[in-house]
């Protein structure tokens, strides 16, 4: 921003009002007056070039220093060409002296020059040669010095003249200051320019009205150069929630707009599914029946719970049952949607029913779940199931009601029996099976069905109650196909797959495990 | 109205003295430079004497220096001229006037004047 | 340091005269013109590089040039006759202030 002055004086803004000293009197400097468009222009003149040794001054009114630290003197002046003058006037000089001194209190018509510092000489860019000066054309010059620091109550400036023809026009005596300035949402105050070229006056700034300093942020600070520019912001100011920066200034935000936080963005419409905000809003409430998250921002649009899974399908294979569904109709707004598996069971005698999570094996965690299907095992046989699958958002746990869809499934099979080869020789195959531990108590006997290869025709069965059998009597190096499958009080459980096991050849020897 | 109005004039005889006065109304006496110019009978103008506003300057010509003494009352809004070992030279129309600026004029108001005669 | 003027110059009325005022001071200070009718106090005519008093007809000019001013009457008028002085600040130190002479200006 660009400096302001303080004027401390103005001559020619004073009309001749000011009636500064000169000495000596009246034959040095001399007050003149020349009208210009009807203005009367006043200056101040002296033009003793033919006589030698002039040394004529002239001393301004005291003038008082308030709280300048450094000022600036502008000086408009003509200086006639010594060329002017017969044989160029040897005593003619083309410059002057400016000069200035502190006091305390006004001297009054008491002059000393023995009291006053040497500012400058002061030359003129340009002279006013003999054929201007008859044309009417005078070469004005302008010359600025400046003086600090400062420091006693007031001062006067001086000019000697040493035998020049010189004509004052204007002095104009000011110090700057930094103008009153609004950055960054930050107020800072009129400060005086300091007096050190090199410093800069840091100058704390305060942060408009709903303006804050955001958090870790820096407090606002300028600096104050000499020249009155204010230079090198530091840190700033935002518009507090909701407030939006209009200008230099924060507004509050709109009915039906709301800012929830420090920063420079402007005030955001309220989003889907909010109430009308009052003006200031910080955040806009949710209408009835929808919510926002801990997590959700303020910008995102209320939601609510989703619906249930459109679609379930529970499909019994053995003693498994793969669940499958679809997502929830209406999505709540969201997308963050989980599903979890829940599972009871019941026994059909007696129509008693429990949880069943601890007996069952899920071939995923059933909460959380982010796909639409999941199998679960390890069913027991003969008993009824029933599966709820319910969908749920980040805002289901701000609601008691849940959203959930039930499938039944009634399991008649053993889960059919994992087999293996435990060895074998020329003439025998030794096999094992397992079914799991909750199914072991229904299961009466195991049935073992085998047959040659590509014979059809004929199989041969044997029963037995444990979990493993050794099939003798068989053609060496020849495949068999082997089925277990478990027998119960009900009937016949779910068979194994057939496996192909082959006996050794002659040449192999005794009984290898496989 | 601005007007300067003097008295004092009169014969006088060589060797002495009299006191001219000028009184000044209509404007701020204090602020400006006055003079006094005389004009000898059927002569020129011939500048006299000078003092400052507040009085703490004075200058004269030649031709009267160390006999003539400036002087001036800035509460009575009045200007004197004490002339003493006057000399038949001296005779003349004695005019009091304003320096409109400065401390050299111009003048831009005169008294009415008043004439001073030296003859024994 | 002198300031010369002619002792008299004549014009017929509505005629332009001009009355010249030579003299040092003129190269370093403007010089002003009085008017002076018999039995009254100079008037002031002009001043500075050209400025006249409010009340002064602007039939009335000055001008310089080098060491000479001069004073133009322009349609010059009965009542325009009287002594005419001109009157500088004297450059030299000598004085303050110097008159010329004065020219007795007549409209025939």
């Known amino acids: 921003a660009q400096g302001k002055e303080v004027v401390l004086l103005d001559f020619a803004a004073a009309g001749g009002e000011l009636g500064w000293l000169t000495h000596p009197y009246g034959k040095g400097w001399d007050l003149m007056q020349n009208i210009m468009n009807d203005m009367p222009i006043y200056m101040y003149s002296v033009c003793n070039v033919m006589s030698g040794d002039q040394d004529n001054w002239l001393r301004t009114n005291w003038v008082y220093r308030g709280e300048a630290e450094r000022i600036f003197i502008e000086l408009k002046f003509t200086v006639r060409d010594c060329n002017s003058f017969p044989g160029g006037a040897s005593s003619c000089k083309e410059t002057f002296n400016l000069y200035y001194a502190e006091s305390d209190l006004d001297y009054g018509t008491n002059f000393q020059k023995r009291l006053f510092t040497k500012i400058d000489t002061i030359a003129p860019d340009e002279i006013t040669v003999s054929s201007d000066f008859e044309a009417r054309h005078v070469k004005l010059n302008v010359e600025e010095r400046s003086v600090g620091p400062l420091t006693r109550k007031g001062f006067y400036l001086a000019f000697q003249d040493i035998g020049a023809c010189v004509a004052l026009l204007s002095v104009r005596v000011y110090y700057k200051k930094c103008p009153e300035l609004l950055q960054g949402l930050a107020h800072f105050p009129e400060t005086i320019a300091g007096s050190d070229a090199p410093s800069l006056a840091t100058v704390a700034g305060t942060c408009v009205d709903h303006a804050v300093v955001p958090p870790g942020g820096e407090e606002p600070r300028m600096h104050c150069a000499v020249d009155g520019e204010w230079l090198v912001p530091i840190g700033q100011c935002l518009c507090q929630a909701g407030y939006e920066k209009v200008e230099d200034a924060c507004q509050a935000c709109s009915p039906g707009f709301f800012k929830f936080e420090a920063s420079e963005s402007p005030c955001l419409e309220c989003p889907e599914h909010t109430l009308p905000s009052p003006e200031g809003a910080t955040s806009c409430e949710c209408e009835e029946g929808f919510f926002r998250a801990p997590q959700d921002p303020a910008s995102m649009p209320c939601t609510r719970p989703p619906s249930a899974p459109h679609y379930l399908t529970a499909v019994g294979m053995g003693a498994k049952v793969e669940l499958r569904w679809t997502p929830p109709q209406d999505s709540g707004g969201r997308e963050d949607i989980v599903y979890s598996v829940t599972c009871e069971q019941c026994w059909p005698e007696s129509g008693e029913c429990g949880p069943c999570e601890a007996s069952v094996r899920y071939s995923e965690p059933p909460h959380g779940l982010t796909r639409t299907s999941v199998t679960v095992s390890d069913l027991e046989p003969h008993m009824n199931y029933t599966f709820t699958v319910e969908a749920r958002n980040g805002v289901s746990g701000l609601v008691t009601s849940r959203s959930f869809r039930t499938a039944s499934v009634s399991i008649n099979q053993t889960e059919p029996p994992k087999v293996r080869l435990e060895g074998r020789s020329t003439t025998s195959l030794s096999v094992s099976w397992s079914i799991p531990p909750p199914q072991q108590s229904r299961v009466w006997k195991y049935e073992v069905t085998y047959r040659k290869k590509g014979d059809s025709n004929s199989y041969n069965v044997r029963r037995t109650e444990g979990f493993s059998v050794t099939l003798d009597d068989l053609a060496p190096d020849t495949t068999y196909l082997v089925q277990v499958q478990a027998l119960t009080q009900e009937g016949q459980g779910a068979g194994s797959k057939v496996h192909e096991f082959q006996t050794l050849s002659p040449e192999g020897s005794g009984n290898l495990a496989v | 109205q601005v007007q300067l109005v003097q008295s004092g004039g009169g014969l006088v005889q060589p060797g002495g003295s009299l006191r001219l006065s000028c009184a000044a109304s209509g404007f701020t006496f204090s602020s400006y430079a006055m003079h006094w110019v005389r004009q000898a009978p059927g002569k020129g103008l011939e500048w006299v004497t000078v003092?400052?506003?507040?009085?703490?300057?004075?200058y004269y010509a030649d031709s009267v220096k160390g006999r003539f003494t400036i002087s001036r009352d800035n509460s009575k809004n009045t200007l004197y001229l004490q002339m003493n070992s006057l000399r038949a030279e001296d005779t003349a129309v004695y005019y009091c006037?304003?320096?409109?600026?400065?401390?050299?004029?111009?003048?831009?108001?005169w008294g009415q004047g008043t004439l001073v005669t030296v003859s024994s | 340091s002198e300031l010369t003027q002619p002792p008299s110059v004549s014009v017929a009325p509505g005629q332009t005269v001009t009355i010249t005022c030579q003299g040092d001071s003129l190269r370093s200070y403007y010089a002003s013109w009085y008017q002076q009718k018999p039995g009254t106090a100079p008037k002031l005519l002009i001043y500075g590089e050209n400025n006249r008093p409010s009340g002064v007809p602007d039939r009335f000019s000055g001008s310089s040039s080098g060491t000479s001013a001069s004073l133009t009457i322009t349609g010059a008028q009965a009542e325009d006759e009287a002594d005419y002085y001109c009157?500088?600040?004297?450059?030299?130190?000598?004085?303050?202030?110097?008159f010329g002479g004065g020219t007795k200006l007549t409209v025939l």
């Open positions: 009157n500088s600040r004297d450059s030299s130190g000598t004085h303050l202030t110097v």
């Open positions: 003092i400052s506003p507040p009085g703490s300057n004075k």
């Open positions: 006037a304003r320096a409109s600026v400065g401390a050299t004029g111009p003048f831009d108001i």
